[in-house]
Interface confidence: low
């Protein structure tokens, strides 16, 4: 499939101008190669009319130009003084005309309307309101006022001052007569439809002395704005329909066959299943404008999108709308990464998040997508040292491995952690990525005691048992804090006895705290990693209490509290409400090059690279061990 993209149809009127934008992947080869606009012949060839190398056909001399914008990956063809002869099939493309790196464009130039003298032209967008003004003379002030629409040869009555309304206009038309000083009546038509376009005649009086005024109503279907985004990337549709529909339900829909437009999301709570976990509809501003963000773009997301306002929350005739044509470029710079990560209850997951390598100093964020209302993504952790209260001790965002990838580790998993999570930064907005965490049955691989109590001034030894499958991995202990997990010295105590059917390669690695102080209280993690790529982790909370009896404590699996108390914290936490979406600076882009498919076996739980149609419930509350 060609990565070149442009408008499929361009319509204009004789004498007018058109501006046609074509998009291409902005690689250095593409930026510098020849750009062209050619007309397709009946026998299949394509005759160049204008190119970026300076060629201009005699047909276009003095009325056309082609401008390349390499930094945007676009070029624009402007054609003026259009005639009906310009109607036809064209291609905009790169390189050689016959090479296939092109996009087909149909140009339709129609004759301007043959208007009667003294015709007032009204040009109004679909779904909007028009006011047709009809002047009259004093002698017709008391006489019947009427508006007709010319249908074929005959005028058909639309509305009159005696109370008649044509059924096609019921509920959306009114006739206003100004004070006698004005000698003017007005017809206001709301929720304009394409079928409303045409020639109208307004009349005051019915005899030969009646006053007549011709009007031509043109109803414009919105030209779709072209949007060119990378596969696996992100798109934002900004929808501004005007303050007159501020209190009407809003929607975004995707056109399917014919005139059908399937709702993607609306403000009444509807959301298409295909967009679960990867869409947010931003709360509207006072003027009724809103935006919709879609992440993890797929091939099948390409197409025509409409946003609109209607009480039903879906497209109806007369809805004011805005339109976009989305092209998903499959030659994406965004690397493939897992869309589903599976973790065992009680264990952990490590998620690799891509970001723009050029923005290594950007702030990194991780948020939990919530489907309630119109979707939101409250932040859980950032790279500046903030962690949401419920996640203390079990969530960490690490800048490693760097160079376009950061890591998020979440441990002490429960079924409530199942759901969709977004990786983002305060830099480029096109690379927001989504991962679904699924909680599966199984046993954690690492074995640690439950909550542990240390005695002030004494020594504490905490064991972590690693099965043989991790024999080739680096094993570590660290102390969690809100900026990460600081590595601590640990001792290899030899093979572990905690595993059945496990050979000498299993390991018991202990953390020793000498002369325990109050500062030693907190969360400790043991885990495995390979270089800067992190695998499974297990967490232990160490409480510190006054001395009761002398001696050091050596905690075994059996002696520790196997099931620590779980306390659900209330929701009075710092929440950056919707910032993840309202503030575009909170979003990430760019090509992360770390290939997350080579994740450590078992250490990162199992990973699916395919997109998943299943959905996990979003987490609402999380447990914090004390």
């Amino acid at each position: 499939k060609s990565p070149i993209f442009g408008p499929e149809e361009v319509n204009s009127v004789e004498g007018n101008s058109v501006s046609i934008t074509c998009y291409y992947p902005p690689t250095s080869v593409n930026r510098h190669t020849r750009k062209y606009w050619c007309r397709q012949g009946a026998r299949g060839g394509c005759i160049t009319l204008i190119s970026s190398e300076g060629y201009v056909s005699s047909k276009y001399a003095g009325r056309a130009n082609l401008t390349n914008f390499p930094e945007n990956g676009t070029f624009v063809v402007n054609i003026a003084q259009l005639s009906q002869d310009d109607s036809g099939r064209y291609k905009c493309g790169l390189g050689i005309n016959s090479r296939g790196l092109s996009f087909d464009v149909s140009l339709e130039v129609s004759q301007g309307p043959g208007l009667l003298n003294d015709t007032k032209v009204y040009t109004v967008d679909l779904g909007r309101t028009v006011t047709i003004n009809c002047p009259f003379k004093t002698e017709n002030a008391q006489k019947r006022k009427s508006l007709y629409k010319q249908i074929g040869l005959y005028p058909v009555l639309v509305i009159d001052s005696s109370g008649y309304v044509n059924p096609n206009y019921t509920g959306r038309i009114r006739l206003d007569i100004q004070g006698t000083g004005q000698l003017l009546f007005s017809v206001v038509i709301n929720q304009l439809r394409l079928s409303d376009a045409g020639q109208y005649l307004c009349q005051a009086g019915d005899d030969s002395n009646s006053n007549k005024k011709n009007a031509d109503l043109q109803v414009l279907k919105p030209e779709p704005e072209l949007v060119y985004e990378d596969l696996r990337g992100s798109v934002t549709f900004h929808c501004a329909l005007g303050p007159e529909v501020a209190n009407v339900a809003k929607f975004l829909c995707r056109q399917s066959s014919g005139e059908n437009c399937d709702v993607v999301v609306n403000t009444l709570g509807k959301r298409a299943p295909a967009f679960e976990g990867r869409i947010l509809l931003n709360p509207q501003d006072k003027d009724g404008s809103f935006s919709v963000v879609i992440t993890g773009l797929r091939k099948e997301d390409a197409g025509r999108y409409l946003c609109g306002a209607h009480s039903d929350g879906q497209l109806q005739e007369g809805s004011p709308i805005q339109a976009w044509q989305l092209f998903v470029n499959e030659e994406s710079t965004i690397p493939r990464s897992p869309t589903v990560v599976k973790g065992v209850a009680g264990s952990s997951v490590a998620v690799l998040c891509p970001y723009n390598r050029k923005e290594s100093k950007s702030i990194k964020y991780w948020c939990l997508w919530e489907g309630a209302q119109n979707g939101r993504c409250p932040l859980l952790v950032d790279s500046e040292g903030w962690v949401k209260a419920q996640y203390e001790g079990r969530l960490s965002l690490l800048e490693e491995p760097g160079n376009g990838t950061f890591t998020v580790i979440l441990n002490q998993l429960t079924s409530r952690d199942a759901g969709f999570y977004w990786c983002l930064t305060n830099g480029d907005t096109l690379w927001r990525t989504t991962v679904e965490i699924k909680i599966i049955e199984g046993e954690p691989n690492l074995k640690v005691p439950g909550n542990v109590t240390a005695v002030l001034g004494e020594t504490l030894k905490v064991p972590c048992h690693f099965p043989c499958k991790f024999s080739s991995y680096e094993k570590y202990w660290c102390k969690w804090n809100n900026t990460g997990c600081q590595a601590l010295p640990s001792q290899d105590e030899g093979p572990s006895k905690a595993f059945v059917n496990c050979d000498e390669n299993s390991r018991l690695v202990s953390l020793t705290l000498n002369l325990v102080t109050r500062a030693d209280e907190g969360w400790y993690w043991c885990g495995v990693k390979q270089g800067h790529f992190y695998g499974e982790t297990a967490a232990v909370y160490v409480a510190v209490e006054e001395r009761k009896a002398a001696g050091s404590r050596d905690v075994s699996l059996a002696k520790a509290d196997a099931a620590p108390d779980e306390k659900v914290l209330d929701s009075g936490f710092r929440e950056i409400e919707n910032k993840a979406i309202q503030d575009p600076r909170l979003f990430a882009e760019e090509k992360a090059v770390a290939d997350t498919r080579d994740q450590a076996d078992g250490s990162r739980a199992s990973v699916d690279s395919g997109s998943s149609e299943e959905q996990g419930g979003s987490s609402r509350h999380h447990h914090h061990h004390h």
Epitope: T27, S28, V29, E330, E331, P335, V593, D595
Partner: nanobody, 116 residues
Framework: QVQLVESGGGLVQAGGSLRLSCAAS????????MGWFRQAPGKEREFVAA????????YYADSVKGRFTISRDNAKNTVYLQMNSLKPEDTAVYYC?????????WGQGTQVTVSS
């Protein structure tokens, strides 16, 4: 970081064929577009061919179109350049590049000499 090592160069008669290989080390090979460039003595390095990360699209310089074919095997972390109908003007050092459109990573090059 990606390291690239080219092989397959050599001396060949005009009209003959050669197949160049470029082996990449590093776990990120499949994320990159890959390309071949060449530099003849006293001339600037010039673009020859490129291939997208998934092999879905290829690009060629006009001078080699129809004679050279670029391909890749992501399982083997290798990109190939099959050169047929070689001409004396194809004589150059051929360089493999990862992320060629952004002038990313380069190999050391392999010499191709076409005698008439």
């Amino acid at each position: 970081q990606v390291q690239l090592v080219e092989s397959g160069g050599g001396l060949v008669q005009a009209g003959g064929s050669l197949r160049l290989s470029c082996a990449a080390s590093g776990r990120t090979f499949s994320s990159y577009a890959m390309g071949w460039f060449r530099q003849a003595p006293g001339k600037e390095r010039e673009f020859v061919a490129a291939i997208t990360w998934n092999g879905g699209t290829t690009y060629y310089a006009d001078s080699v179109k129809g004679r050279f074919t670029i391909s890749r095997d992501n399982a083997k972390n290798t990109v190939y350049l099959q050169m047929n109908s070689l001409k004396p003007e194809d004589t150059a050092v051929y360089y493999c590049a990862a992320d060629p459109f952004n002038q990313g990573y380069w190999g050391q090059g392999t010499q191709v000499t076409v005698s008439s």
